[in-house]
């Protein structure tokens, strides 16, 4: 199957790499604008320069293009705990990330929130915290893993999945309850 090409891609494919077809005259191939610039005016004719202008502050283009406007710089989402790793330049968007000892949880492809890495209290670190993944903990005896925290088996109810991990403790609790009855 041939992938479906949009009108713009079809037009560009007629010209050699680094050039695009003039929107009013399909016999002319104009040179694309460098990253950090945008298309102000198409080239007037073959072999003549495209009029490209540098992006204004607060905007960028990260690759060669024939965009009529630069793209607006992204803003890091403070409400998601994001911090600015590097600020926007004319040829690169803002880079947002998380603080030290935090990881990213993605709500969608391009929206993430920063969370603190688990410390594995009452357990040991099985896998260290990474950029996009929390620490993986292994719990000590008498504790079970719930939402990546080691919780005491005394908080394990019979209906929960922790019963297998906490079985000896549950039996002991049940035993002491039984022995207390007359």
């Amino acid at each position: 199957l041939v992938p479906h090409l949009g009108d713009r891609e079809k037009r560009d494919s007629v010209c050699p790499q680094g050039k695009y077809i003039h929107p009013q005259n399909n016999s002319i191939c104009c040179t694309k604008c460098h990253k950090g610039t945008y298309l102000y005016n198409d080239c007037p004719g073959p072999g003549q320069d495209t009029d490209c202008r540098e992006c204004e502050s607060g905007s960028f283009t990260a690759s060669e293009n024939h965009l009529r406007h630069c793209l607006s710089c992204s803003k890091c989402r403070k409400e998601m705990g994001q911090v600015e790793i590097s600020s926007c330049t004319v040829d690169r968007d803002t880079v947002c990330g998380c603080r030290k000892n935090q990881y990213r949880h993605y709500w969608s492809e391009n929206l993430f929130q920063c969370f603190n890495c688990s410390l594995c209290l009452n357990g040991t670190v099985h896998l260290s915290c990474q950029e996009k993944q929390n620490t993986v903990c292994t719990c000590h005896a008498g504790f079970f893993l719930r939402e990546n925290e080691c919780v005491s088996c005394s908080n394990c109810k019979k209906s929960l999945e922790c019963t297998k991990l906490c079985l000896p403790q549950i039996e002991n609790v049940k035993g002491t309850e039984d022995s207390g009855t007359t």
Epitope: S108, E109, E147
Partner: nanobody, 124 residues
Framework: EVQLLESGGGLVQPGGSLRLSCAAS????????MGWVRQAPGKGLEWVSF????????YYADSVKGRFTISRDNSKNTLYLQMNSLRAEDTAVYYC?????????????????WGQGTLVTVSS
Amino acid sequence: EVQLLESGGGLVQPGGSLRLSCAASGFTFGGYQMGWVRQAPGKGLEWVSFIDFTGAHTYYADSVKGRFTISRDNSKNTLYLQMNSLRAEDTAVYYCAKLSDDLTLPERFPFDYWGQGTLVTVSS
């Protein structure tokens, strides 16, 4: 067909509580992150809260932090929003929404499906 049906809205006095529910069908509920968004009269859409697949990760807008609690029951295909200490400014239509990984969706509204909404009115 994906369906999200909200319920639990109504009229409540300031300081009161409400629990919203969202019954989901037509997709594998436990395989998707979910959220609540709201629209106050004459205002734009506002994120309220998100929850991941299991409840391990949650997000709350600053305006509702400490008052609202999002939860889910994957066995019942239901999303909840417990709203306490309600204020007049919480008056809005509340929508249950399914988060999406579709890159063509704008970051400000990363949902591919949402319900018809339930009206919450906070007034004395």
